[in-house]
């Protein structure tokens, strides 16, 4: 009982060291504004959580859209 | 929130002009800056913007002498401009370029401007 | 290159009147355009983006229209207030541009 306390606890202290959980820690969304469609072509590059770099954050919005899918943005620049 | 240019000021032909750009209440990784001039008496003219992710882009009149970099621990972007002549005279301004990706993109937020004249 | 093209240069109505300034791209900007004031010795106030959406604060008597190629402002019961320079500026693209803004159009109050 008392090892598993100490294991418990630790995994506890581990989990709260690590930071935010979930999705936060993922990516952020990709801002997406439904009454006002279309992207424009300046490349500003995000990288994706799939791995991808999309060349601008609505790129990656509409392509959410269109593969119904939910990929984060995990870092601003190209992955 | 807000933008201001550094000071300005009296530059010879030739000189390097380099105005500083900083930024209050608003983090450099998640917006675009833009730098805008406007000679005495004439209309606005774009010089570059720097976006979210770093990349400058330039006019291209501006390409060959212009330099647009940004450190965003200190929240400033910086414009440095060669090989400046008597046409490079102008009020310069920083403003913050919101969503660059989107068709929404529009500079919301402007500094008051500063002066650069170049003479010998 | 995505050059921008304002009409007219100047333009003076009778206060309550309607001003109507006219902004032509070279190429397809879809709706990525930006309408500003200007007043002399003041940084240029952001009015409409989007080609048609109101920024903050700015009264509902200017109005955008446009897409594509054409777009228009619109400043109905004018006021000595709107006595200003007047400028377009696309946000579509930064590649290859001479200039993102319009030459400006100098709207005058009678």
């Known amino acids: 009982m008392k090892v598993t306390g100490i294991f418990l606890l630790s995994a506890l202290a581990l989990l709260s060291l690590s930071g935010n959980t979930g999705a936060d820690s993922l990516g952020r969304e990709a801002k997406c504004y439904n009454e006002l469609n279309g992207c424009t072509k300046i490349y500003d590059p995000v990288c994706g959580t799939d791995g991808n770099t999309y060349p601008n954050e609505c790129v990656l919005c509409f392509e959410n859209r269109k593969r119904q899918t939910s990929i984060l943005i995990q870092k601003s620049g190209p992955c | 929130q807000s933008v201001k240019e550094s000071e300005g000021g009296l530059f010879k032909p030739t000189d390097t002009l380099t105005l500083t750009c900083t930024v209050s209440?608003?983090?450099?990784?998640?917006?675009?800056i833009g730098w805008v001039r406007q000679a005495p008496g004439n209309g606005l003219e774009w010089i570059g913007t720097?976006?979210?992710?770093?990349?400058?882009y330039y006019a291209n009149w501006a390409k060959s002498r212009s330099t647009i970099t940004r450190n965003t621990n200190l929240n400033t972007v910086t414009l440095k401009m060669t090989s400046l002549t008597a046409a490079d005279t102008a009020t310069y301004f920083c403003?913050?370029?919101?969503?660059?990706?989107?068709?929404?993109?529009?500079?919301?937020?402007w500094g008051q401007g500063t002066l650069v004249t170049v003479s010998s | 290159a995505y050059d921008m093209t304002q009409t007219p240069a100047s333009v003076s109505e009778p206060v309550r009147g309607t001003v109507t300034i006219k902004c032509q791209a070279s190429q397809s900007i879809s709706t990525a355009l930006a309408w500003y004031q200007q007043k002399p010795g003041q940084p240029p106030k952001l009015l409409i983006y989007?080609?048609?959406y109101l920024a903050s604060g700015v009264p509902s008597r200017f109005s955008g229209s446009g897409s594509g190629t054409e777009f228009t402002l619109t400043i109905s019961d004018l006021e000595c207030a709107d006595a200003a320079t007047y400028y377009c500026h696309q946000g579509y693209s930064a590649s290859n541009v001479d200039n993102t803004f319009g030459g400006g159009t100098e709207g005058g109050v009678k």
């Open positions: 403003a913050r370029n919101l969503d660059p990706a989107y068709s929404t993109t529009r500079l919301d937020l």
């Open positions: 209440g608003f983090s450099l990784s998640s917006y675009a």
């Open positions: 989007a080609a048609s």
């Open positions: 720097i976006v979210t992710s770093g990349i400058p």
